[in-house]
Interface confidence: medium
């Protein structure tokens, strides 16, 4: 006869490890007992459990409540045991010694490997600003045994670089994602994907990109100069820009204070019924934490086209 076992048994941390030991013999052979031991280089061979055909399972005090027989149905030639709730300290060599009748004793050794799944963490890089060169967007670190795989899943164009180091019984892997920040990346997801033999499925951590920028400012409302005439109501100038963080707006008049009645409401400058006093250079100021921009326009309020006298005056004045 011979023992059927496995050179290497792999179990995930916290799960039950089945240590296999099956005697394959002639039909008339019997297994009297199976002795299990931990082969510890420090302390020699330490008994784990004794599986007796007549008296059942006896577990040594050090492993009480941790060693069981596999659930039924059980084959009388099967000396396998379950080691409950495997921890990293269980990693090492185990030995089963099978006493048979009439063939005698057989023994086999196996190595238990405990997989330690990673707990990944994602760390965003420094604040991203449009205009920067290649910049760290985020780094993702995962430590486990064996080494986890760390990659990135994103539509954003960038470069990945990994570094890893072995540490005692585990390995740590850090992957960095670098990019050249642009406003189109704002709100885009950057996902760290961690794979490991101890995980049923990949672990994913998503970071939403925020790129600080401030667009050039421009002013809308003067497209048709002929609309800017004395008496017109509801005239407005709107400052156009966009940014991240969202910008704040302010209006000033270059050649003095804003005329009375002119109201600032966010990005919009609202005028009362127009008079020639409203003519002037208006400046829109846009700013956020990153930068500030300005755009200026010249408003020229025309005399009322229905008043020919004023029209003549306007022409002669010019």
């Amino acid at each position: 006869g011979e023992l059927e076992t496995s050179d290497l048994v792999t179990v995930v941390l916290g799960q039950d490890a089945k240590l296999p030991c099956f005697y394959r013999g002639d039909p008339d052979e019997q297994v009297g007992q199976v002795a299990w031991a931990r082969v510890d280089p420090n302390e020699g061979t330490r008994e784990l459990a004794l599986l007796h055909s007549k008296y059942g399972l006896h577990v040594s005090p050090a492993y009480e409540d941790r060693v069981e027989q596999p659930p039924p149905p059980r084959d009388p030639l099967d000396g396998s045991i379950l080691l409950r709730n495997a921890v990293q300290a269980d990693e090492g060599e185990y030995e089963c010694r099978v006493s048979t009748f009439p063939a005698g004793s057989f023994q086999a050794r196996m190595r238990l490997r405990v997989l330690v799944p990673p707990l990944p963490s994602l760390n965003p890089g420094p604040p991203l600003e449009e205009g920067q060169g290649l910049t760290l967007a985020a780094s993702c670190t995962a430590e486990g045994s064996p080494a986890p795989s760390v990659t990135w899943d994103t539509e954003v164009k960038g470069t990945q670089s990994s570094r890893s180091f072995k540490h005692s019984r585990s390995a740590a892997v850090t992957s960095e994602f670098h990019l050249v920040p642009s406003r189109s990346m704002n709100g885009q997801p950057l996902t760290c994907v961690v794979s490991h033999p101890g995980l049923l499925q990949d672990q994913r951590i998503t970071h939403t990109l925020q790129v600080a920028f401030l667009a050039e400012a421009s002013v809308r409302g003067l497209e048709d100069q002929n609309l800017w005439h004395v008496g017109r109501e509801g005239a407005t100038l709107k400052c156009l820009s966009e940014g991240q963080p969202p910008p704040k707006y302010n209006w000033t008049r270059l050649d003095g204070p804003l005329p009375s009645g002119v109201r600032v409401k966010g990005d919009t400058l609202g005028f009362p019924p127009l008079t020639t006093e409203h003519s002037g250079v208006y400046v829109c100021h846009v700013s956020n934490e990153l930068s500030s921009r300005a755009s200026q326009v010249t408003v020229e309020v025309l005399a009322d086209p229905e008043d020919p006298g004023k029209q003549v005056d306007l022409v002669s004045a010019s």
């Epitope: 064996p146 072995k166 540490h167 005692s168 019984r169 390995a171």
Partner: antibody
């Protein structure tokens, strides 16, 4: 019998390349982390690279970017691709198995970098 | 990176006498999770590859004579040959396998006085 046998060493000019191989037998190769360690004549041991059971790789700064370690579990083989070789890379290169230290070593293969 | 420093560089001891080699690491190699020191000792004879003597700072590799013993924890370690034999003439190296890049000490040459 547990055994590691290196091959592929030889004389190469500075800037050249060489690929070392290590054939493993007598144990479940795929279950062990593997290493390359070198030793210049009359000098001490220097760790060169390691590869884990899932193909994770590790290098010291002195060879990073020039050397690449790899493994082929189906062939029980370990490799070291060495590019941009320098005179300072001249040494005996050993492959070694890791299990609580480097418990199994090959006999080594000699690499000489010289013009 | 962890730097390993051995002392002395060479050592001459009479047959049957005790030989002691020290090894210091620039940072601790004690892994708190399992309370093990990730330090190994190797013996290398001329023309041969290194041979693992001790791992986890104090555990003898199988087949290694019990006159070899290791001790220490954290950053300071010692290899002791209790009664030097002629076949123990060799260079001895300590190595940390706590974290990459793995590093060896510079070696200690043991000779017979």
């Amino acid at each position: 019998e547990v055994q590691l046998v290196e091959s592929g060493g030889g004389l190469v000019q500075p800037g050249g390349s060489l690929r070392l191989s290590c054939a493993a037998s007598g144990f479940t190769f795929s279950s062990y982390d593997m290493h390359w360690v070198r030793q210049a004549t009359g000098k001490g041991l220097e760790w060169v690279s390691a590869i884990g059971t899932v193909g994770d790789t590790y290098y010291p700064g002195s060879v990073k970017g020039r050397f690449t370690i790899s493994r082929e579990n189906a062939k029980n083989s370990l490799y070291l691709q060495m590019n941009s070789l320098r005179a300072g890379d001249t040494a005996v290169y050993y492959c070694a198995r890791e299990w609580n230290g480097m418990d199994v070593w090959g006999q080594g293969t000699t690499v000489t970098v010289s013009s | 990176d962890i730097v390993m420093t051995q002392s002395p560089d060479s050592l001459a001891v009479s047959l049957g006498e005790r030989a002691t080699i020290n090894c210091k690491s620039s940072q601790s190699v004690l892994y708190n999770s399992n309370n093990k020191n990730y330090l190994a000792w190797y013996q290398q004879k001329p023309g041969q590859p290194p041979k693992l003597l001790i791992y986890w700072a104090s555990t003898r590799e199988s087949g290694v004579p019990d006159r070899f013993s290791g001790s220490g924890s954290g950053t300071d370690f010692t290899l002791t040959i209790s009664s030097l034999q002629a076949e123990d003439v060799a260079v001895y190296y300590c190595q940390q396998f706590y974290t990459t890049p793995y590093s060896f000490g510079q070696g200690t040459k043991v000779e017979i006085k």
